[in-house]
Interface confidence: low
């Protein structure tokens, strides 16, 4: 058969949950402390909450059925009677009472024909303000007749016909009634919720609803023009040219900011947005949803997309509607011919209307932003240049911030890219130019996207002119080749000498993509004599071991994930892992990761790695322990860092000396 409507699916779920209590029993969730009841969907059933409020489960006869004394469940179908009597069956006795008062309407409800009545519950009538009720029942009851006729349709309409966004023609001056049928099974009629649906009568059908509904006369634009509280909004809509859309056909939800909402925004921000047509349009579009959303449809958190493209979390807390968790809706369900308006008392400024400063204010990067300000880079972050700001998280500076000197200023300039980027378009190997004139490289890994040593820690925030990338560390642009990095650091004098003697200098100086696990002098000194002697005994072996320390791609710590098997230049794979923010290679911790070079990255280690084939095994022809001498000499040689040192002859002499 045809696909079931959401309402029918929810009813089916309720029936399923109630079946252990007998035939045609439906499980109903009642919000504690209220009379609000809901047929229950799967999610609500397990959460036992509606709008964050606890519910109790009760079991009632499903629509159209009744109990039989002495029998389990609700085995009997309700007897069919006319519409007037069916009003009593569904408990809408006040509607019966008012029908009697009109004199004309009861004969119609009891006579031939086929009608649909959206009958307000007794509570709905009781909750009408006294002056509204008085006006309905005065004027020789003509207003009451008109009001009741507006609740009627001149044919039988069942819930499976009630489609989202459709309009029905009422029996009062052919005025439209707006129907919304939401994916969660809730059906609304002019934003009044269907409580009990599809109660058949001999001459039609009755649906019980939770409000008295009234005719809709104005479109969204007209409501904005009428209401004093929308004076600022009115001007903004006119300036943006959105009034045409808001008075046209369609079904929209306008989250309409009141004058008070605009007043909460600092003058500088508001003036900037109001003076920028694109930002203004984005701001207003961020308050418009693509379809009509009645408050009654919200029973839990729901992600909705605005016309601007931002996702808002619409939810509820008790009787209050919330947006992004805040109860900022002050007046809900103001119906228009082309949608529904909810008054909000806070402006929803989208990222696309914000400066980089404003984007950063809502991110966890305030420390970095203060540094940019102090370094005199504030203009770039609030102007109309197309830029991308690479802003490290506050946690990066937990041990303090650097002093603002020339070096820091330059470093910060290299955190600003001269283009407005989106991370989804970045690709591996791409280079990005900074305000400081540096070229930064992009590295794309399975679970991360990094720019040099720093990886993106949160979704981009794309502003009016600039985009904010929240980064997981301070970015350090490369200052030279791997060889330059090693030569410039006293900790690696022995490694430099070893690299030179193994003939790998050129490799680590030329263009390329290398990950070098660089053992410190201490690492070499800590080698067991046997390993040291083996390492030094053979230039080829030395080259082999050194190549095992060099990966054939750039792997920064942010790209490791849990475990990466990195192919070395020697051929075997290195097991690189990250646990509790500590990088390890072959299960040995890295002392200092991510020293960037133009042709790679250096990770400092305090041990020398052994390739699988070299892992210690007993050999009879052990070299003498005095091999340590080579490192004493290498250390001295390499301090003269500008000279190229050839150690092959030194090896020969040492090996001669080591023979017994």
């Amino acid at each position: 058969g045809p696909a079931k409507s959401p309402y029918q699916l929810v009813l089916q779920h309720s029936r399923l949950r109630g079946r252990q209590h007998g035939p045609n029993v439906c499980a109903v969730q009642k919000v504690i402390g209220t009379n609000r009841k809901y047929f229950t969907n799967c999610k609500q059933w397990y959460q036992r909450k509606i709008c964050g409020k606890s519910t109790v489960i009760s079991y009632e006869c499903c629509p159209g059925y009744e109990k039989v004394p002495g029998e389990k469940g609700c085995p009997a179908a309700l007897p069919l009677s006319n519409l007037y009597e069916t009003l009593g069956v569904v408990g809408s006795t006040t509607t019966q009472l008012y029908t009697d008062r009109t004199e004309k309407l009861r004969p119609e409800m009891e006579g031939p024909g086929s009608f649909t009545i959206f009958a307000p519950s007794n509570e709905a009538w009781a909750s009408l303000p006294a002056e509204v009720l008085d006006s309905l029942v005065s004027n020789v009851n003509i207003e009451l007749l008109n009001a009741l006729r507006y609740h009627m349709v001149g044919r039988r309409v069942l819930t499976d016909e009630l489609k989202h966004g459709m309009t029905l023609t009422s029996m009062y001056q052919n005025s439209n009634i707006q129907i919304h049928h939401y994916p969660n099974g809730i059906v609304t009629v002019n934003c009044a919720r269907l409580l009990k649906a599809d109660h058949h009568a001999t001459n039609g059908v009755v649906h019980l609803i939770d409000k008295v509904i009234s005719t809709i006369t104005n479109n969204i634009q007209q409501i904005i023009e009428i209401e004093d509280t929308f004076e600022t909004l009115r001007a903004a809509v006119a300036a943006s040219g959105l009034n045409t859309m808001l008075e046209g056909n369609g079904q929209y939800t306008l989250l309409a900011p009141t004058n008070e909402a605009f007043e909460k925004i600092p003058s500088e921000t508001l003036n900037r947005i109001l003076g920028d047509p694109e930002a203004l349009r984005d701001l207003l579009n961020n308050h418009i949803l693509k379809s009509a959303m009645c408050a009654e449809a919200i029973v839990a958190g729901l992600s909705v997309e605005t016309l601007e493209g931002t996702t808002l979390e619409v939810g509820c807390s008790g009787d209050m509607l919330t947006i992004n968790g805040k109860a900022i809706i002050s007046n809900k369900d103001i119906l228009a011919t082309n949608g529904v308006i909810h008054y909000i008392d806070e402006l929803l400024i989208p990222d696309s209307a914000k400066t980089l400063f404003e984007l950063a204010a809502e991110s966890d990067v305030s420390t970095a932003i203060d540094l940019f300000r102090q370094a005199g880079l504030g203009n770039h972050l609030s102007g109309s240049e197309r830029l991308t700001l690479l802003a490290p998280l506050n946690s990066v500076f937990k041990d303090g911030t650097p002093p603002i000197d020339a070096h820091t200023r330059n470093l910060l300039r290299n955190h600003i890219i001269k283009d407005q980027l989106a991370s989804k378009y970045l690709y591996h190997g791409q280079t990005l130019e900074t305000l400081g004139g540096k070229k930064l490289r992009v590295f794309v890994y399975r679970n991360s996207l990094c720019i040099e040593n720093s990886c993106i820690a949160a979704h981009d925030k794309r502003g009016r002119y600039g985009t904010l990338f929240t980064m997981d560390r301070v970015l350090t642009p490369p200052m030279g080749t791997v060889m330059d990095v090693l030569k410039g650091d006293n900790r690696f004098s022995m490694l430099v000498a070893a690299i030179q003697s193994a003939g790998l200098t050129e490799t680590l100086n030329r263009e390329g993509v290398y990950t070098v696990f660089a053992p410190t002098n201490e690492a070499f000194r800590a080698l067991p004599p046997r390993e040291r002697s083996r390492l030094l005994g053979d230039a080829k072996e030395l080259a082999n071991i050194l190549k095992y320390h060099i990966g054939d791609e750039i792997l920064v710590s942010g790209g490791i994930g849990a475990l990466v098997r990195l192919k070395s230049l020697q051929g075997d794979k290195l097991e690189v892992s990250l646990k509790n923010n500590v990088v390890s290679v072959n299960k040995e911790p890295v002392a200092e990761p991510d020293i960037m070079a133009t042709n790679g990255v250096v990770h400092v280690i305090t041990n020398v790695l052994q390739p699988p084939a070299n892992r210690p095994q007993e050999r009879g022809d052990e070299l003498a322990d005095s091999a340590l001498e080579i490192f004493k000499q290498a250390s001295a040689f390499s301090r003269a860092s500008q000279r190229s040192v050839r150690l092959a002859p030194v090896y020969q002499k040492l090996l001669e000396r080591m023979k017994h």
Epitope: K264, S267, R373
Partner: antibody, heavy 120, light 113 residues
Framework: QVQLVQSGAEVKKPGSSVKVSCKAS????????MYWVRQAPGQGLEWVGT????????YYAQKVQGRFTITRDSSTSTLYLELSSLRSEDTAVYYC?????????????WGQGTTVTVSS | EIVMTQSPATLSVSPGERATMSCRAS????????????LAWYQQKPGQAPRLLIY???TRETGIPARFSGSGSGTEFTLTISSLQSEDFAVYYC?????????FGQGTKLEIK
């Protein structure tokens, strides 16, 4: 370094006009919001008006609205304040002030001040 | 407009001692979206232009000694000078930049006791 050098003192009669200037150097003038703040003799500070970085927007204190005009000339990096329909209560030291950056509105750098005396 | 009220009008403190002055705004200067307070403090010595000390209610301007600190949020703010130096005796103004017209407090005169 940032410098804001203001024109000299002026003595004017009530109802007359005067134009005070402020020459900026040491920074990109067109990248900053600029302000005028005044201080009547023995009194506190009072914001007079603001002009945006591009000179498109100007905002004034209610007391001076319609009488004072702020303009800027990016080619000469000069800020102006034209005071017309002068009153005795306009007697004050007028300070030219540079904002922190393109939007943020606190007063980061101040000129030396220009004394305007309105007396019959 | 937002009215800024400073207290006391005059504060007499000995050099080396701590000075604390208050500033109250007639409405909150805390902007919820960025959790920043739009308030600045200035120092003015006789015959001189004012000088920026603090912005965002608590961020010291570059070059301002660490003995100056700002605190507070919403409508109540404080400027504290931890150990007064002779050059600190001056008039101090708070200023809001949350809404036009930008307004100053009437000033607190810090004098030698």
């Amino acid at each position: 370094q940032v410098q804001l050098v203001q024109s000299g003192a002026e003595v004017k009669k009530p109802g007359s006009s005067v134009k005070v200037s402020c020459k900026a150097s040491g920074f990109t003038f067109s990248d900053y919001y600029m302000y005028w703040v005044r201080q009547a003799p023995g009194q506190g500070l009072e914001w007079v008006g603001t002009i945006s970085d591009g000179g498109i927007y100007a905002y004034y204190a209610q007391k001076v609205q319609g009488r004072f005009t702020i303009t800027r000339d990016s080619s000469t990096s000069t800020l102006y304040l034209e005071l017309s329909s002068l009153r005795s209560e306009d007697t004050a030291v007028y300070y030219c002030v540079r904002g922190w950056d393109r939007y943020d509105s606190w007063f980061a750098c101040w000129g030396q001040g220009t004394t305007v005396t309105v007396s019959s | 407009e937002i009215v800024m009220t400073q207290s006391p009008a005059t504060l007499s403190v000995s050099p080396g001692e701590r000075a604390t002055m208050s500033c109250r705004a007639s409405q909150s200067l805390l902007y919820s979206s960025n959790q920043k307070n739009y308030l600045a403090w200035y120092q003015q010595k006789p015959g001189q232009a004012p000088r920026l000390l603090i912005y965002w209610a608590s961020t010291r301007e570059t070059g301002i000694p660490a003995r100056f600190s700002g605190s507070g949020s919403g409508t109540e703010f404080t400027l504290t000078i931890s150990s007064l130096q002779s050059e600190d005796f001056a008039v101090y103004y708070c200023q809001q930049y949350y809404r036009y017209p930008y307004t100053f407090g009437q000033g607190t005169k810090l004098e030698i006791k």
